[in-house]
Interface confidence: low
């Protein structure tokens, strides 16, 4: 008599997570008796998938009526299919007995599944950096299958080029993750840009997932210092201006000093913006000339988000007089913007 | 049946270029990875790399970046290999092989083969 | 890379002889591993994938066992169309690579 065939007519099938999977399986003859049982994997550790005769397997249905006389079809149905559900199916024909004996298995059919990535997550760096450093940002995505994966990163809709990707694992697996490292030289203009993390995949149908940054959250753009002094007023005071440009953020502290000392102490709050992000600030302080007998040295000090102060002093000539009304004095500068130590 | 159907032998020049093509037969050709596999007369196989047919993209291994080219014509189920600068040691067959695997893009085990293509590179 | 070593080189047995092919792995492949059988002047044919797993239409007394860096492959009884040269792979890591192949031969 011609040998029982145990056909599983697809080598494999690939279906979207939450969708049907139908593992198609027929057989070649009604004899001997016995009945079909689906296993996914093969060799001891097989998982028992569906069995016609017991058990309960509520996301397995049959295709066709296996009870009905004379059925050759023991296709099956898995509904509401996950990652997890990945794996090779055997269809296997058992001979009945007392316990069956297995007599003939399919070639197998491999279930593949394909699962949407995450929504792309990036974070930045941990403390701030300046204009002309490297900052890095990582984008994650997880759970998609299969395995291909495309992720770009952008900077203001330009490419980034200096990435780093991996794909996990690099074997098969029921789902992957990615993650990716992109190298960003910042500049003081970065204020208001944003990179972006474009991840696509077979499930997106053309349409990426994207995750963003702002680079404000990982810029300091440190602040410019000029003092100037204006016109020596009737009453012998001296209105000395320290202007404060183009900070990032607003965190900021201005004291003033006077030959050493502490004269007043601001803090910058409710500031308008640039139109790069940056923000200004001027204070200004009262010097009565007369009541000094010497030249005095004041020095602006400004404290920008937790760095190193940033001092700019200059004299205040008292020796000079008399002083007419609506002459200017210039202010002489003998500090130094140290700007660059950071 | 599926059939992997690759161009005749070729004897080049050193210095000269070749293009072998790989026609899919039976299947979609961007369903599976299309791989690349060289053997060197009397040798054993060499895995070069491969193609993701769904995004045209290659993957290359170490030996056969710069002048080894992979790429596609999906309008005509056919994968291209192409070796630019040809030396005496490029004599070899070239095989191209899918990977099994509905949407598996990953390397993995080689269900079929082409036939294999002779490339001779003498002076 | 990962690299595949085959052992025996070559062996040579008569029909109906049960051979054993073995296959180590420098690293810890899961079961990644596929074999091969090729004929001089032809292609290599699939015959196992996933260490032990037949591809259809390769008769049952080709076998193949093992996971993680020592794998088998076993003709149960040997016939006159077995002799080949036949080469396991990995595909568990990048790049892909096969063994140097053993070359079975009639005795």
């Known amino acids: 008599e011609e040998e029982l065939q145990v056909i599983q007519p697809e080598k494999s099938v690939s279906v979207a997570a939450g969708d049907s999977a139908t593992l198609n399986c027929t057989v070649s003859s009604l004899i001997p008796v016995g009945p079909i049982q689906w296993f996914r994997g093969a060799g001891p550790g097989r998982e028992l998938i569906y069995n016609l005769k017991e058990g309960h397997f509520p996301r397995v249905t049959p295709v066709s009526d296996p009870t009905k006389r004379n059925n050759m079809d023991f296709s099956i149905r898995i509904s509401n299919i996950t990652p997890a559900d990945a794996g090779t199916y055997y269809c296997v024909k058992f001979r009945k007995g007392s316990p069956d004996v297995e007599l003939k298995s399919g070639a197998g059919t491999e279930l593949s599944v394909r699962a949407k990535p995450s929504a792309p997550v990036v974070s930045g760096p941990a403390v701030r950096a300046t204009a002309e450093h490297t900052v890095s940002f990582t984008c994650e995505s997880h759970g998609f299958s299969p395995r291909d994966i495309t992720l770009k990163w952008f900077k203001n809709g330009n490419e980034l080029s200096d990435v780093q990707t991996n794909v996990d694992p690099a074997g098969k697996s029921v789902s992957y993750s990615i993650r990716s490292t992109a190298r960003v030289v910042l500049t003081r203009r970065d204020v208001h840009s944003q990179v972006i993390c474009e991840v696509a995949h077979v499930t997106l149908q053309g349409d990426p997932l994207r995750g963003t940054a702002n680079l404000s959250e990982a810029i300091r753009v440190p602040p410019f210092l000029e003092v100037t002094q204006q016109s020596m007023r009737a009453d012998n005071q001296v209105n000395v201006t320290c202007q404060v440009t183009k900070f990032y953020p607003q965190r900021l502290q201005l004291t003033w000093l006077e030959n050493g000392n502490v004269s007043r102490t601001e803090m910058a709050s409710a500031l308008p913006e640039n139109k790069d992000g940056t923000y200004n600030w001027t204070s200004w302080l009262l010097v009565n000339v007369s009541a000094h007998r010497d030249d005095v040295k004041l020095t602006c000090q400004v404290e920008h988000d937790g760095q190193p102060a940033v001092n700019k002093s200059f004299s205040v000539k008292v020796s000079a007089h008399p002083k007419e009304q609506g002459s200017n004095t210039a202010a002489e500068n003998t500090g130094t913007n140290e700007r660059n130590i950071y | 049946q599926i059939q992997l159907v690759q161009s005749g032998s070729e004897l080049k020049k050193p210095g000269a270029s070749v293009k072998v093509s790989c026609r899919a037969r039976?299947?979609?050709?961007?369903?599976?990875?299309m791989n690349w596999v060289r053997q060197a007369p009397g040798q054993g196989l060499e895995w070069m790399g491969f193609?993701?047919?769904?995004?045209?993209?290659?993957t290359y291994a170490q030996g056969f970046k710069g002048r080894f080219v992979f790429s596609l014509d999906t309008s005509v189920s056919t994968a291209y290999l192409q070796i630019g600068s040809l030396k005496a040691e490029d004599t070899a067959v070239y095989y191209c092989?899918?990977?099994?695997?509905?949407?598996?893009?990953?390397?993995?085990?080689?269900?079929?083969w082409g036939q294999g293509t002779l490339v001779t590179v003498s002076s | 890379d990962i690299q595949m070593t085959q052992s025996p080189s070559s062996l040579s047995a008569s029909v109906g002889d049960r051979v054993t092919i073995t296959c180590r792995a420098s690293?810890?492949?899961?079961?990644?591993l596929a074999w091969y059988q090729q004929k001089p002047g032809k292609s290599p044919k699939a015959l196992i994938f996933?260490?032990?797993y037949r591809y259809i239409g390769v008769p049952s007394r080709f076998s193949g066992s093992g996971s993680g860096t020592d794998f088998t492959l076993t003709i149960s009884s040997l016939q006159p169309e077995d002799f080949a040269t036949y080469y396991c792979?990995?595909?568990?890591?990048?790049?892909?690579?096969f063994g140097q192949g053993t070359k079975l031969e009639i005795k």
């Open positions: 092989a899918r990977t099994r695997g509905y949407y598996d893009f990953d390397g993995g085990a080689f269900d079929y």
């Open positions: 039976g299947y979609t050709l961007t369903d599976y990875a």
């Open positions: 193609i993701n047919t769904y995004t045209g993209e290659p």
């Open positions: 690293q810890n492949v899961g079961t990644h």
């Open positions: 996933s260490a032990s």
């Open positions: 792979q990995q595909y568990n890591t990048y790049p892909l690579t």
